[in-house]
């Protein structure tokens, strides 16, 4: 039988966006595999990703079902062929992730403005409601579902010809913003979660800007 | 129709090798991985081991590990166990059969009809 | 390894009765547990998986349920057809375990 030694997993990570989440680790497998488990702090490990090769799981499905829980992980190593094993007998080598709660910790997506529309000198800016994994009563959770009023989005505006930028703030998907006629203005939005401490912004959206509204204005 | 079909009993000698084969049909090889069970006459039912298909990465229970040796052959959808170092207490049904994959549960869905191998001097 | 034990190892029941077996786990296995029959002569089949999800095919008179590490299998009407013996496996901790069976008899 080989002589290559089974290794404990390493650097054991989340990777999370918007309730997407992925156990990554290292190193990758030579003759061994991996399993891993998954466990609330009160809860029973379940395993996933059973004797794979990969050096990721997607945990998703099991942290969506309660996503203010705090998780854990743990990656279990096989020897894969005719491979001893080093862990004491009995006893398969493994290794803890650190602690993760979705509802704090996940990273928040780049938002998308969905739509602007001119209203006289106002301007109706729309962000899209992302949907989530986040499930409920079989129907799939949009981030603001989830995070109700946690949730703020913030507009950064310009006009085309300056570089001053305005802001905004609003708890819902949708801003109201004054405007000067027949200026043409840019947008970009940001989510922004004010009561975590950490991992609190979302990236910038794409910025888009208007074209000239001299024809909806009716000049 | 998704079916895994075994090769026919043996008789070995103790100290001798058997090389058992399992071929599968009616669903994408890859995608599954296959376990080999066994059961003693009048025993239940023992995991001796799992290949994965897609790359022949093959895992086995510790109580085999040294003996078995599980292999595929992508090209005709087919996988055998080796068994080597025969002993009396080997004598069992070798059964295949299709259990899940790396995200699903590790359930017997589909089984071979076995084959007997007997070891007697 | 985890240990499965199951109980009764065989039982005698009438056709119509109500028949239950055990399985337990020597430690916390999830729901990752399956059930299945194996009829004289044949390999076996799968019935339940993962504790308490019925496989296609298999009438509903076969039930599964959990509470903790105790896992139960439910015949709701014993049928003639429901002669073999049943076995229960984990799959959560490596190596895969099998519990020692149950032999179902008609009276």
């Known amino acids: 039988s080989g002589t290559t030694n089974t290794v404990a997993a390493y650097n054991l990570t989340w990777k999370s966006t918007n309730f997407k989440t992925i156990l990554e680790w290292e190193p990758k497998p030579v003759n061994q595999v991996y399993t891993v488990q998954i466990s609330t702090k009160s809860g029973d490990w379940k395993s996933k990703c059973f004797y794979t090769t990969d050096t990721e799981c997607d945990l998703t499905d099991e942290i969506v079902k309660d996503v203010k829980q705090t998780y854990l992980a743990r990656v279990f190593s096989y020897p894969a062929g005719n491979v001893e094993s080093t862990g004491s007998a009995g006893e398969p080598l493994y290794e803890n992730s650190p602690e993760f709660t979705p509802y704090l910790e996940t990273n928040l997506g780049q938002p998308t403005i969905q739509s602007f529309e001119q209203v006289g000198t106002k301007v109706n800016v729309t962000v899209e409601d992302e949907r989530t994994l986040v499930r409920r009563n079989n129907t799939f959770l949009s981030l603001r579902d989830v995070f109700g009023k946690d949730l703020i989005y913030t507009l950064y505006y310009w006009k085309s010809s300056s570089s001053g930028k305005k802001t905004a703030k609003t708890n819902t998907n949708e801003f109201l913003i004054d405007v000067d006629k027949g200026e043409n203005y840019c947008f970009s939005v940001q989510a922004v979660i004010f009561s975590r401490k950490t991992n609190h912004k979302s990236p910038e959206s794409i910025t888009k800007c208007t074209e000239q509204w001299k024809s909806v204005l009716g000049e | 129709q998704v079916q895994l079909v075994q090769s026919g009993a043996e008789v070995k000698k103790p100290g001798a090798s058997v090389k058992v084969s399992c071929k599968a049909s009616?669903?994408?090889?890859?995608?599954?991985?296959m376990h080999w069970v066994r059961q003693a006459p009048g025993q239940g039912l023992e995991w001796m081991g799992i290949i994965n298909p897609s790359g022949g990465i093959t895992v086995y229970a510790q109580k085999f590990q040294g003996r078995v040796t599980m292999t595929r052959d992508t090209s005709t959808s087919t996988v055998y166990m080796e068994l080597s170092s025969l002993r009396s207490e080997d004598t069992a049904v070798y059964y295949c059969a299709r259990g899940g994959s790396k995200v699903a549960a590790l359930a017997f869905d589909i089984w071979g009809q076995g084959t007997m191998v007997t070891v007697s001097s | 390894d985890i240990q499965m034990t199951q109980s009764p190892s065989s039982l005698s029941a009438s056709v119509g009765d109500r028949v239950t077996i055990t399985c337990q786990a020597s430690?916390?296995?999830?729901?990752?547990l399956n059930w299945y029959q194996q009829k004289p002569g044949k390999a076996p089949k799968l019935l339940i998986y993962d504790a308490s999800n019925l496989e296609t095919g298999v009438p509903s008179r076969f039930s599964g349920s959990r509470s903790g590490t105790d896992f139960t299998f439910t015949i709701s009407s014993l049928q003639p057809e429901d002669i073999a013996t049943y076995y229960c496996?984990?799959?959560?901790?490596?190596?895969?375990?099998f519990g020692g069976g149950t032999k179902v008899e008609i009276k």
């Open positions: 496996q984990q799959y959560n901790f490596h190596p895969l375990t």
């Open positions: 430690q916390d296995i999830s729901n990752s």
């Open positions: 009616g669903y994408t090889f890859a995608n599954y991985y």
